[in-house]
Structure formats: structure tokens, C-alpha cells
């Protein structure tokens, strides 16, 4: 599944909105990491356009902020990317998923750095 700012034509929706989302997920990333958030729609069916919101402001896709169907990727994350992220139904602003993201100064420990 490719991410990017390319447009996608959407067909008919399968279902009306599902249940309210659960409590927010807390995620920690290292500086320079790619922040990846995923938000599959409730019930599995499309429900109109969606928007990712950070600290109350709608995110516009860019070279660093990549948006795909139900996914958000923020490349080369820095401390300024920390905050409250939500994926919302564009039309109603209903929150589908909610994330608390913290970007630490140190790179994440995902890579093996013991090889010196």
C-alpha cells in the first residue's frame, strides 16, 4: 500500500459510521524516525473522506507528511512532531482513532548499535 499525496477516486461507501473509538493509543518514536499511524475504519467500510488532525489543526499532505487510506506517515520526525493526533471523519469531525505521539531526542533503539 503506497503512501503519498496522490489523489484517489472513491466509490460508494459500504456502511454508515461504526461505534465510538476506544481510548487513545500512546506511541513513542525516536528523533529521525518515521511516525506511522494506522486507523482502519470501524466496520471495515469506507465512510467518506478523512482528515488527520494534530493538536487541533488539520494536516495537509506534503513531502514529509504522507497520507494514504487510513494511514499517516511523518518522515524524519522531530520533537515538534510530538502531540495529539486523531484521524477524523472529515464531514462530521467524528474521531475514528486517537494517538498520543512523543518523539524523543534519542534515535529509537530499533537498530542494532552495538557493532563497534
Amino acid at each position: 500500500e503506497s503512501l503519498g499525496t496522490e489523489q484517489r477516486v472513491v466509490g460508494r461507501a459500504a456502511e454508515v459510521p461504526g461505534p465510538e473509538p476506544g481510548q487513545q493509543e500512546q506511541l513513542v518514536f525516536g528523533s529521525g524516525d518515521a511516525v506511522e499511524l494506522s486507523c482502519p475504519p470501524p466496520g471495515g467500510g469506507p465512510m467518506g473522506p478523512t482528515v488527520w488532525v494534530k493538536d487541533g489543526t488539520g494536516l495537509v499532505p506534503s513531502e514529509r507528511v504522507l497520507v494514504g487510506p487510513q494511514r499517516l506517515q511523518v518522515l524524519n520526525a522531530s520533537h515538534e512532531d510530538s502531540g495529539a493526533y486523531s484521524c477524523r471523519q472529515r464531514l462530521t469531525q467524528r474521531v475514528l482513532c486517537h494517538f498520543s505521539v512523543r518523539v524523543t531526542d534519542a534515535p529509537s533503539s530499533g537498530d542494532d548499535e552495538d557493532g563497534e
Partner: antibody, heavy 121, light 110 residues
Framework: EVQLLESGGGLVQPGGSLRLSCAAS????????MSWVRQAPGKGLEWVSG????????YYADSVKGRFTISRDNSKNTLYLQMNSLRAEDTAVYYC??????????????WGQGTLVTVSS | QSVLTQPPSASGTPGQRVTISCSGS????????VSWYQQLPGTAPKLLIY???KRPSGVPDRFSGSKSGTSASLAISGLRSEDEADYYC???????????FGGGTKLTVL
């Protein structure tokens, strides 16, 4: 001040093509969702298509699906509607409409003055 | 025929209160917000009400919106001659994946 100025309308034969433009000013165009809405002479409003900034999605009314293509050029602050295989029933005034902020409930808060498309032989 | 149903006409005298209804279904009004637009003769539509009952700045508080179930209403109190116009309701429809408008109501101020 928000301004939307449509252009490109005119007389075209059935089966022909036309490209409408909507020049936007007074707001950060790339951050807003945009739609085309049309109104046949003496008739009501009909939503045609919408393009959504937040997820790059595009939607069309069934009546134009496969014939019309909506697009935007954020560097030119311009919204487009490419209309192919035009039919007599596509005759209408075409309005460009701006949606509210992405983090607010959707609504068409500003409209252009419209451009008339006439499909006739 | 429109997905959202409005009465084709309504009328009232100056100072009166008039109500315009908009009936839909669970795939639109029942699960989404309604907005209302005013179109004066020969002009582009103008946003009157959004999110069922919110008024944009500049819209007089004589205009109010409400919703119950799959129906919405626009009320205009203290009717004025300049209110004579066409009024449209609109909502997103999930089954059609697009916006739908009512057929419009022509308001005449007698």
C-alpha cells in the same frame, strides 16, 4: 477576502469537452477541500464532485462519474473540472464551492458566481 | 427526484415565522450534519446554517436550524421581504458517497 472566480463555460456540442477553472484567493487554497456544484436552468442545486485535501480522496456524483474529472493545482490556487462526453442534461451554471476548515464540520462556506455551460447542437 | 425532500414552496407575511422541512434517511441526515443555503434571485447560494444548527458569522439570528432523526428544519422568524429566495438543505450521503441537496423551497413573502 475569500474570492472564487469560475471561468471556461460556454456553448459546446453533445459529446464535446470543456474544462472549467476556479481561481481562488484570500485563503490558503491547499489547506481546503473544494467542490463543484451545478444548477440547471430553473432547477435546484446538484453536487457534482469534491476533492479532499486531508486524504487526497475524490468523489463524484453518479450522474457524472466516468465523464468528469476534478483536479487542483495548489501552486496556481486553481480548481479544475474537466468535462468530457457532455450531454444536454449537463447544461447548467457550475459553481465552485469552498469547504470549511479541515478540522471543522464540513459545509460550503463560500461560493463563486458560477459559469454557464450550455450543451446543444 | 432529490434524495432529500423539501416542500417546493412556502410563504408568510412580514414579521411571521415560517418553517421549511427537509426529510432524508439514515444514510444522510440520520447519520450526518445538515447545512442550509439561501439563494436570492440571480445570485450564488449563501451558507445560512451548518452542523444542523450553527450560524456562520453575519447570518442574523432570525435564522435557526434543528434536526430530529432523519428530518431537519429551517426556521425564519420576523420574516422580511428580503428573505424571499430559494432555500436548500444539504447533507453527505454515505450510500451514495457524495453530497445531496434537497430540491429547494421557494419562499414568498406576501
Amino acid at each position: 477576502e475569500v474570492q472564487l472566480l469560475e471561468s471556461g463555460g460556454g456553448l459546446v456540442q453533445p459529446g464535446g469537452s470543456l474544462r472549467l477553472s476556479c481561481a481562488a484567493s484570500g485563503f490558503t487554497f491547499s489547506s481546503y477541500d473544494m467542490s463543484w456544484v451545478r444548477q440547471a436552468p430553473g432547477k435546484g442545486l446538484e453536487w457534482v464532485s469534491g476533492i479532499y485535501s486531508g486524504d487526497g480522496s475524490i468523489y463524484y456524483a453518479d450522474s457524472v462519474k466516468g465523464r468528469f474529472t476534478i483536479s487542483r493545482d495548489n501552486s496556481k490556487n486553481t480548481l479544475y473540472l474537466q468535462m468530457n462526453s457532455l450531454r444536454a442534461e449537463d447544461t447548467a451554471v457550475y459553481y465552485c464551492a469552498k469547504d470549511g476548515p479541515m478540522n471543522e464540520i464540513s459545509r460550503f462556506d463560500y461560493w463563486g458566481q458560477g459559469t454557464l455551460v450550455t450543451v446543444s447542437s | 427526484q432529490s434524495v432529500l425532500t423539501q416542500p417546493p414552496s412556502a410563504s408568510g407575511t412580514p414579521g411571521q415565522r415560517v418553517t421549511i422541512s427537509c426529510s432524508g434517511s439514515s444514510s444522510n441526515i440520520g447519520n450526518n450534519y445538515v447545512s442550509w443555503y439561501q439563494q436570492l434571485p440571480g445570485t450564488a447560494p449563501k451558507l445560512l446554517i451548518y452542523a444542523d444548527s450553527k450560524r456562520p458569522s453575519g447570518v442574523p439570528d432570525r435564522f435557526s436550524g434543528s434536526k430530529s432523526g432523519t428530518s431537519a428544519s429551517l426556521a425564519i422568524s420576523g420574516l422580511r421581504s428580503e428573505d424571499e429566495a430559494d432555500y436548500y438543505c444539504a447533507s453527505w450521503d454515505y450510500s451514495l458517497s457524495g453530497y445531496v441537496f434537497g430540491g429547494g423551497t421557494k419562499l414568498t413573502v406576501l
